[in-house]
């Protein structure tokens, strides 16, 4: 058993049929010694008396809010949550496996630049009685500070018969050094509580590996005289790290016909313009990637050829 | 050229070669992003290789103030990785494929380090400890981890030279 926060405790249980469970001793937080009784949740049934209560925690029915009273007055509470371990593996029932970039990916994180700011998100099909708390640090043995906000519901989607809820959180490294080469990964830890079930999820990454620039901005076409060619120009996204002479991007320009089956013409360039042939009904798209480190490409920015 | 006295390197040449190094480092291990090395107890290897740290003066302001600190740091790292790529971790069994870019990568590391410190100029003696012996089954993972770290190192070096070529060239 360990304390998650004040008056909230997590009991770690090996979860299998007829498991013996864990013996837990609760102590009433009071100077009083006599006339103390204990109840669980809303029930008025007295579970025991005295300053301490010893219980055998085996299942969710044994978890909940234990309260000690004296003469009708509440003295203190202890909320017990369960953390299940099945076949040596902690349960992951609350969050959905996103399976990208690999199986058992419950948290996904992205950064728009090297400022030390990043966003993580996760998915669940649970709509109520759900709370999340997020902590983060750079490195684990001698951790350096990363500050995370509160997790918020950021999207709802219908997937077949189910509703899926996306939660996200923004974090900022306290003393970020955008130009340095990271040697210690960022660690993100999410505590998830659904009713009386506790689970924790972790992710470990370097900012450089989760970089995904915003799409290029101000994408414009300029027809070239007496030619089917056009000059495409664009700018670095506002959110990208500066100066651009240091934090450089590379770009992919694509000409795509109306039909997905049509051959795509692609050009790669480090410049912020390119000359391409604009076919009728086609569109021109540009995306960006860090020039020197192969992290994710941005989403496409697009304009029609006409 | 970057000589200990403090004259400028051939920023544009360094830019071109460092960008080539980035390409080679990724072609030597393109699938790097799909494997989580931290599951492999990665901290020891990442601790053992050079890193361009915050105080090394490799940020735009540091380069403007005095690029020599950063260039020396990059030079040290290039020599370090050059020695690793020339060791039996890469030359021993299992043999690299004949068309592996590791050979080119090794040569380019040496080339860039010589651009930064031509013959007859010396920052300091480059020392690295004896390498632990490795068996074939260990080498694959060590190669992977070293290339992974090298990708991050040369990315920072390439940014430095790109910025230098754009803003510090005579």
């Amino acid at each position: 058993i360990w304390e998650l926060k004040k008056d909230v405790y997590v009991v770690e249980l090996d979860w299998y049929p007829d498991a013996p469970g864990e013996m837990v001793v609760l102590t009433c937080d009071t100077p009083e010694e006599d006339g103390i009784t204990w109840t669980l949740d809303q029930s008025s049934e007295v579970l025991g008396s005295g300053k301490t209560l010893t219980i055998q925690v085996k299942e969710f029915g044994d978890a909940g809010q234990y309260t000690c009273h004296k003469g009708g007055e509440v003295l203190s509470h202890s909320l017990l949550l369960l953390h299940k371990k099945e076949d040596g593996i902690w349960s992951t029932d609350i969050l959905k496996d996103q399976k990208e970039p690999k199986n058992k990916t419950f948290l996904r994180c992205e950064a728009k630049n090297y400022s030390g700011r990043f966003t993580c998100w996760w998915l669940t099909t649970i709509s109520t009685d759900l709370t999340f708390s997020v902590k983060s640090s750079r490195g684990s043995s001698d951790p350096q500070g990363v500050t995370c906000g509160a997790a918020t519901l950021s999207a709802e989607r219908v997937r077949g018969d189910n509703k899926e809820y996306e939660y996200s959180v923004e974090c900022q490294e306290d003393s970020a050094c955008p130009a340095a080469e990271e040697s210690l990964p960022i660690e993100v830890m999410v505590d998830a509580v659904h009713k009386l079930k506790y689970e924790n999820y972790t992710s470990s990454f370097f900012i450089r590996d989760i970089i995904k620039p915003d799409p290029p901005k101000n994408l414009q076409l300029k027809p070239l005289k007496n030619s089917r060619q056009v000059e495409v120009s664009w700018e670095y996204p506002d959110t990208w790290s500066t100066p651009h002479s240091y934090f450089s991007l590379t770009f992919c320009v694509q000409v795509q016909g109306k039909s997905k089956r049509e051959k795509k013409d692609r050009v790669f360039t480090d410049k912020t313009s390119a000359t391409v042939i604009c076919r009728k009904n086609a569109s021109i798209s540009v995306r960006a990637q860090d020039r020197y480190y192969s992290s994710s490409w941005s989403e496409w920015a697009s304009v029609p050829c006409s | 050229r970057a000589v200990p006295g403090g004259s400028s390197p051939a920023w544009t040449q360094c830019q071109q070669l460092s960008q080539k190094l980035c390409t080679l480092a990724w072609s030597a291990h393109p699938l790097v992003g799909h494997m989580d090395l931290r599951e492999e107890g990665d901290e020891e290897t990442t601790n053992d290789v050079p890193h361009i740290q915050c105080g090394d003066g490799c940020d735009p302001q540091g380069l403007r103030d005095n690029s020599q600190f950063c260039l020396q740091r990059i030079h040290q790292g290039l020599i370090f990785y050059e020695k690793l790529l020339g060791s039996d971790i890469f030359t021993g069994e299992p043999s690299l494929l004949p068309d592996s870019p590791v050979g080119q990568l090794h040569a380019s590391l040496l080339g860039l380090s010589q651009l930064l410190q031509p013959e007859g100029h010396h920052w300091e003696t480059q020392q690295i400890p004896s390498l632990s012996p490795s068996q074939p089954w260990q080498r694959l993972l060590l190669r992977f981890k070293i290339l992974r770290s090298l990708q991050a190192f040369v990315a920072v070096a390439a940014r430095v030279f790109a910025h230098g070529a754009a803003t510090l060239s005579p």
Partner: antibody, heavy 120, light 113 residues
Framework: QVQLQESGPGLVKPSETLSLTCTVS????????VHWIRQPPGKGLEWIGV???????DYNPSLKSRVTISVDTSKNQFSLKLSSVTAADTAVYYC??????????????WGQGTLVTVSS | DIVMTQSPDSLAVSLGERATINCKPS????????????LAWYQQKPGQPPKLLIY???TRQSGVPDRFSGSGSGTDFTLTISSLQAEDVAVYYC?????????FGQGTKLEIK
């Protein structure tokens, strides 16, 4: 928890072979190298040799011709053999571990040591 | 082989006072690439194995009191005990692991004055 325990005869006759075993627990043999170090009574520490995680060995050049270190991974046991011993080999013999990395590491855990006396 | 020379051979310091032990390797232990010094400090009490105090010249092993500190680089290293306690009476050794064979200093015996 991490444990290393040396065992073997406390008395060996001159010209014979000293044989010691180091039994380890609490860590993976794939991640740690195991060393033998000795300390003559009232004197300093001398490194004898190492068996690397891959099974290869390195020995102190001053002892190389007489030393063999081996491992039995199924039993989590390492052995030290030192041939043609003399009174100068009387010492407390320790086994210790270091984390396998690109470069040789420091010894973070040691066994309690076993005293071997060479005498007829 | 790298020769490790410790000084002094023995040292007597009053309780609460600072104790300083030096270690000079015959060649630099600084890896210029990763800027690490491949030197460790050990404490050995009678009848016990050596105990790791400091690694990479200045990093304190977990559980070691913060009165122990390591400093230095290249060919000059120091172990400092800022305020000597009775339980610090022991022999202290430096170890180089830059090149094999690993080599130790000859040891410094620390006593209470």
């Amino acid at each position: 928890q991490v444990q290393l325990q040396e065992s073997g005869p406390g008395l060996v006759k001159p010209s014979e072979t000293l044989s010691l075993t180091c039994t380890v627990s609490g860590f993976s043999l794939i991640s740690y190298n195991v060393h033998w170090i000795r300390q003559p009574p009232g004197k300093g520490l001398e490194w004898i040799g190492v068996i690397w995680t891959g099974g290869s060995t390195d020995y102190n050049p001053s002892l190389k011709s007489r030393v063999t270190i081996s491992v039995d991974t199924s039993k989590n046991q390492f052995s030290l053999k030192l041939s043609s011993v003399t009174a100068a080999d009387t010492a407390v013999y320790y086994c210790a571990r270091d984390k396998y990395g690109l470069f040789p590491g420091y010894f973070d855990y040691w066994g309690q040591g076993t005293l071997v006396t060479v005498s007829s | 082989d790298i020769v490790m020379t410790q000084s002094p051979d023995s040292l007597a310091v009053s309780l609460g006072e600072r104790a300083t032990i030096n270690c000079k390797p015959s060649q630099s232990l600084l890896s210029s690439g990763n800027r690490k010094n491949y030197l460790a400090w050990y404490q050995q009490k009678p009848g016990q194995p050596p105990k790791l105090l400091i690694y990479y010249a200045s990093t304190r092993q977990s559980g070691v009191p913060d009165r122990f500190s390591g400093s230095g680089s290249g060919t000059d290293f120091t172990l400092t005990i800022s305020s000597l306690q009775a339980e610090d009476v022991a022999v202290y050794y430096c170890l180089q692991h830059f090149n094999y064979p690993w080599t130790f200093g000859q040891g410094t015996k620390l006593e209470i004055k």
